[in-house]
């Protein structure tokens, strides 16, 4: 008999947490676990529960989550990872859109991200997607062409700056940007 | 919103005793790490005790052993610091501090923690 199956990790209400604000880190594994181990990667922190509540989220605090749980002497495979971002840390970039936030289907638009920090990694997040568009840029500046738009990209973006040397240390996010396709 | 608050401080001859508290609010202190640190002036913060490994395991720097005793009542969500036998060099800014993550470490590290309260200062002098 070979490990035991890997739980699910989720952060809710979502990992992008900005600062003070609370966030549960919730294990889930099969009904009648004897143990949880809810863990903290590249360090040696942890937790022996299914539910990490975070009252207030700290820089901290941010970072690489996996769990596992154990059933009499076996341990299951590990959960994928969770990456628990904080935002806030640093000011908030602007996201413009050009040639402007209108535009026809079948067209094309650049959304582009700026912030006044030398900051070499950007997200791009669309409200109700799971998860945001990366792109590492060397520049003060990073551009995400849409290519051919088409009426599922209209709707409201938002972008975060960060550093490469602290991957789980965001902006706040920028202003919302309306994208509205015609 | 999350806090810690520290009391008890104070000045006290070498020799007194002085028992620091660290009430928290916001949260329970429960499955908890917790920790006291110091920092005096011009030098480095320093892990003075904590209850960091879920075992309830108690570390306790060398320069205070026999003499600190970290303890924590869950139904007052307040740690304690009960310091004997105070010396000059025990003079310094104490601080608590908590986490809901346990850590394997087998000394207190202050990067480990991720709520502080905002120090009280301890002064031992004749």
């Known amino acids: 008999s070979g490990p035991l199956p890997k739980p699910s990790l989720q952060a809710l209400p979502s990992s992008l947490v900005p600062l003070e604000k609370p966030v549960t880190l919730r294990c889930q594994g099969p009904p009648g676990v004897d143990l949880y181990r809810l863990e903290k990667l590249s360090s040696s922190r942890y937790q022996d529960q299914a539910v990490l509540f975070i009252p207030a989220m700290k820089r901290s605090l941010a970072g690489r989550y996996r769990c596992s749980y154990q059933n009499g002497s076996l341990w299951s495979l590990p959960s994928d990872q969770l990456e628990l971002v904080a935002t806030g840390v640093f000011a908030k970039p602007s996201l413009s859109a050009q040639p402007g936030p209108a535009v026809s289907s079948g067209g094309d638009v650049t959304l582009q991200c700026q912030t006044r920090y030398g900051f070499d990694q950007f997200a791009l997040y669309k409200e109700g997607d799971p998860a945001p568009y990366k792109n590492p840029e060397r520049w003060y500046r990073a551009s995400f062409p849409i290519i051919t738009v088409t009426a599922a990209h209209s709707g409201t973006y938002r972008c975060y700056s960060f550093s490469s040397r602290d991957p789980y240390l965001w902006s706040a996010p920028s202003d919302p940007l309306e994208l509205v396709v015609t | 919103q999350v806090q810690l608050q520290e009391s008890g401080g104070g000045l006290v001859q070498p020799g007194g005793s002085l028992r620091l508290s660290c009430a928290a609010s916001?949260?329970?202190?429960?499955?908890?790490?917790i920790g006291w640190f110091r920092q005096a002036p011009g030098k480095e913060r320093e892990g003075v005790s904590c209850?960091?490994?879920?075992?309830?395991?108690?570390y306790y720097a060398d320069s205070v052993k026999g003499r600190f005793t970290i303890s924590r009542d869950n139904a007052k969500n307040t740690m304690y610091l009960q310091m004997n036998s105070l010396k000059p060099e025990d003079t310094a800014v104490y601080y608590c501090?908590?986490?809901?993550?346990?850590?394997?470490?087998?000394?207190?590290?202050?990067?480990?923690?991720?709520?502080w309260g905002q120090g009280t200062q301890v002064t031992v002098s004749s």
């Open positions: 209850i960091s490994s879920s075992d309830g395991r108690t």
């Open positions: 916001g949260f329970t202190l429960d499955n908890y790490a």
């Open positions: 501090a908590t986490s809901p993550l346990y850590s394997d470490s087998d000394r207190c590290i202050w990067e480990e923690y991720d709520y």
